[in-house]
């Protein structure tokens, strides 16, 4: 899997999206998850609805949250007043079993807000030891859902 | 109607190819993952492996990987077993089976399976 | 790999009796567990998923219960049609991986 680095603003939310193949992950819940160390374990944040059909319901853990397009084939997470301790490398995932398959790599990027000019030393980059070959830069701005705008459940 | 057909029994020497064949029809056959299941004469039943025919993502039991190849032709709804050199041992029933992912608890069982195809390797 | 262990390995019965199989993974699998019918010559059929769903179109006399390490099939009343041999599966992990079976004979 290639690094998909999303870029946010410190104190601002950051949306991180995730697509799949919504046949080939049918009937899956998903999952973010934060990797502990190059080769560690992805310690779990937050994972969708424990029904599978309600995965479109936003869920939190903190100011992290989730939802799922299950049928548009988008998992989506919101990290809320992002903070220079966020930044890592992430993972979306698809649970079946007890198991997770990797749907995306991710590498949360934390910039230092331009109009806080507090000592911007805190903030995490990637130093040039850690290589994300072909790592895809996306700058994420996120907005929240209209009232009435959450998608409707699908059908079984 | 949900059909798996698989080709017909085959007889084979030691260090001869193989591949058996795996027909779905009645569903979309790129959307499920289909497995291979063997089982030798009198015994129980040994996953080998399961394939997506939607881009041919592929996981093997390791007690038969490198020892068999599954593959998956979507444009004609067919999965694939094959040997490059059969032994006695492999000689077995072979079956494929849909795997269909459950939402109420996000696993996946099989619920339809082939007819079988008898292997019998001998010199 | 997760060993799945079935007992008895084989059961004589008669039609009307209640019988149950027993299948103990060798850890927790949750509830991921499915049971399976052989016949003689004959592929697998799914009897019970998710541990105690039943499948479409099987007979409300077989049942499924059970979590974490071990589970049962109960057929409340045999069926002629009912004599034939037993499957688990669990579906926690890969490699999935079946019991040895358990033949139910006439008695």
């Known amino acids: 899997h290639n690094t998909t680095v999303f870029q946010g603003v410190a104190g601002q939310s950051l949306q991180v999206s995730c697509p799949y193949d919504s046949m080939k992950h049918w009937g899956r819940r998903k999952a973010w998850c934060r990797q502990l160390g190059e080769k560690g374990p992805c310690q779990r944040v937050v994972s969708t609805h424990n029904l599978w059909l309600l995965s479109f319901l936003r869920r939190w853990n903190g100011s992290t949250a989730i939802t799922d397009d299950t049928l548009g084939g988008t998992l989506t997470i919101t990290l809320r007043n992002l903070q220079p301790h966020d930044a890592g490398l992430y993972q979306c995932q698809s649970l079946h079993g007890s198991e997770a398959d990797t749907l995306r790599k991710v590498l949360v990027e934390v910039l230092a807000d331009p109009l806080d000019h507090r000592d911007a030393g805190d903030l995490w980059f990637p130093g040039e030891s850690e290589s994300f070959e072909d790592a895809h830069v996306e700058h994420s701005i996120s907005r929240s859902l209209l009232e009435g705008e959450i998608p409707f459940p699908p059908t079984s | 109607e949900v059909q798996l057909v698989q080709s017909g029994a085959e007889v084979k020497k030691p260090g001869e190819s193989l591949k058996i064949s795996c027909k779905g029809s009645g569903y979309s056959f790129r959307s499920y993952w289909i497995a291979w299941v063997r089982q030798m004469p009198g015994k129980g039943l040994e996953w080998m492996g399961i394939?997506?025919?939607?881009?041919?993502?592929?996981r093997y039991s390791p007690s038969f990987q490198g020892q068999v190849t599954i593959s998956a032709d979507k444009s004609i709804s067919t999965a694939y077993l094959q040997w490059s050199s059969l032994k006695a041992s492999d000689t077995a029933m072979y079956f494929c089976?849909?795997?269909?992912?459950?939402?109420?608890?996000?696993?996946?069982?099989?619920?339809?399976w082939g007819q079988g195809t008898l292997v019998t390797v001998s010199s | 790999d997760i060993q799945m262990t079935q007992s008895p390995s084989s059961v004589s019965a008669s039609v009307g009796d209640r019988v149950t199989i027993t299948c103990r993974a060798s850890?927790?699998?949750?509830?991921?567990l499915a049971w399976y019918q052989q016949k003689p010559g004959k592929a697998p059929k799914l009897l019970i998923y998710a541990a105690s769903s039943l499948q479409r179109g099987v007979p409300s006399r077989f049942s499924g219960s059970g979590s974490g390490t071990d589970f049962t099939l109960t057929i409340s009343s045999l069926q002629p049609e009912d004599f034939a041999t037993y499957f688990c599966?669990?579906?926690?992990?890969?490699?999935?991986?079946f019991g040895q079976g358990t033949k139910l004979e006439i008695k």
């Open positions: 394939i997506y025919p939607g881009d041919s993502d592929t």
């Open positions: 089976a849909r795997s269909r992912t459950f939402y109420y608890d996000s696993s996946d069982y099989f619920d339809y």
């Open positions: 599966q669990q579906a926690d992990r890969f490699p999935r991986t």
């Open positions: 850890q927790g699998i949750s509830s991921w």
